[in-house]
């Protein structure tokens, strides 16, 4: 029962995590304009992995997609790649884990196969979570570097009199979503791996041994060998419970001129 609960919880946690990774990847608020100690502007800039947006005091928001591939920073491309790999691995992991769930019966699938599938999905979730955490962390590091660079020369003089205020960017909501989601996916993966241990039939094969005692001759022959996953060294004979067949671009989000009523 505990194994089923651990596996089910691992699946749910991973599902939430991957949904979060997808959400973070799609979000526009990876970096947001730093408002602290800055002149108050009537526009608010924020950027995502796929487009940058400007929200005006007027209520209009304008978003422009990054329509170039080669002109983008290598770091941004790397972050995109990490997030996409994380999503793909997570999605495959989810698909595999659905069939691995103990509460779902598919034909005459053996528990050993379910154990292997659980382990596979667990590893996929772990790698997926690590990809998301790495991607978000790389982007965060990029932001921190750029923040201090722009702080160092925040006011760039133009002909002495005129000044251009550089827009500084700080952590956006997507980073926190990404970190939490990556962590959840990682935890879910670990739970799946733990559940795998309990799923695997681990009956140890005892060779037939003859004990020659005075006046008696008793031979103990335990049951035949069953496949083991090799996790741990538990030599107890476990009863394998069968769960049974249960039925359980340049885009502008402008309203029309006056949004007439």
């Amino acid at each position: 029962m505990a194994v089923t609960a651990c596996q089910g919880l691992g699946f749910v946690v991973s599902l939430i995590g991957i949904a979060g990774i997808i959400a973070a990847t799609c979000m526009d608020q990876w970096s947001t304009q730093d408002l602290y100690n800055n002149p108050v502007t009537a526009v608010f800039n924020y950027q995502g992995l796929w487009r940058s947006c400007v929200r005006e005091s007027s209520g209009f928001t304008e978003c422009r997609g990054y329509f170039t591939l080669l002109g983008l920073p290598a770091m941004l491309q790397a972050v995109r790649a990490l997030m996409i790999v994380g999503i793909v691995l997570g999605a495959i992991g989810l698909l595999v884990s659905i069939f691995a769930l103990k509460c779902i019966r598919i034909g005459s699938m053996e528990d050993s196969a379910k154990a292997n599938m659980t382990l596979t999905s667990g590893i996929m979730f772990i790698v997926s979570g690590l990809c998301a955490i790495a991607g978000v962390s790389v982007f965060a590091n990029m932001l921190v570097t750029n923040f201090w660079m722009s702080t160092a020369n925040m006011y760039t003089g133009m002909g002495g009199m005129v000044q251009t205020v550089q827009t500084r960017y700080t952590f956006g909501a997507a980073l926190f979503v990404g970190w939490v989601a990556g962590g959840l996916t990682l935890i879910g993966g670990v739970m799946m791996c733990i559940a795998c241990r309990g799923l695997a039939p681990e009956e140890t094969n005892y060779k037939a041994v003859s004990y020659h005692a005075s006046g008696h001759s008793v031979a103990y022959k335990p049951g035949g060998f069953k496949a083991s996953t090799g996790f741990g060294s538990n030599t107890k004979n476990k009863k394998i419970y069968d769960g049974g067949a249960r039925t359980e671009d340049e885009v502008q989000s402008y309203p029309s001129k006056h949004d007439y009523v």
Epitope: T41, A42, V43, S58, G59, F60, V165, T167, Y254, Y260
Partner: antibody, heavy 118, light 113 residues
Framework: EVQLVESGGGVVQPGGSLRLSCAAS????????MSWVRQAPGKRLEWVAT????????FYPDSVKGRFTISRDNSKNTLYLQMNSLRAEDTAVYYC???????????WSQGLSVTVSS | DIVITQSPDSLAVSLGERATINCKSS????????????LTWYQQKPGQPPKLLFY???TRESGVPDRFTGSGSGTDFTLTISSLQAEDVAVYYC?????????FGGGTKLEIK
Amino acid sequence: EVQLVESGGGVVQPGGSLRLSCAASGFTFSKFGMSWVRQAPGKRLEWVATFSSGGDYTFYPDSVKGRFTISRDNSKNTLYLQMNSLRAEDTAVYYCAKLYYGNSMDSWSQGLSVTVSS
Amino acid sequence: DIVITQSPDSLAVSLGERATINCKSSQSLLNSGNQRNYLTWYQQKPGQPPKLLFYWASTRESGVPDRFTGSGSGTDFTLTISSLQAEDVAVYYCQNAYYYPFTFGGGTKLEIK
């Protein structure tokens, strides 16, 4: 057609208070930022206050900060300007305006005269 | 605060001639996020509220005749009327729409010579 109709102007003594109202129609009021702008006789336009869209953000120039308060009632489609501690230099024609692309003001009221005099 | 300097204070131009009004900002009004200049131009006739001509420095508001042109970037902007008409007599204002407090230029009074 967008319409902005003001009320509440008049003559007030220095140190007194006045509340201007601006009733809006012809557009979805809650979706747009709104501003108050004034113009003293023979002078340039002077921005007085803005109520930003998408959050309760209000902005004022130093000349009126702490004395004037901009507010809005989306259910009544009305913008307000509460003016306290009025001074002679606050005498002007007050306009309410709807914000548009680029934070420009595309629709204006006809203007309301406010005179601060003893 | 951002200082907006408009020149000239007044301008007399013959009908059909070109009129040019300049506007200078003490800081750049270019937003790096969308590469747009947050400068607005208005026309005000006596006894009337201002009328929007251009936003984002050069985007003409609907209904504004195409003899009006807005140009410029960063700190220097220009409003040009290619062929002055009698109905163009008014005071023209430019406005910083990027930084709070929003500030207006002193206005340019355009008259017919």
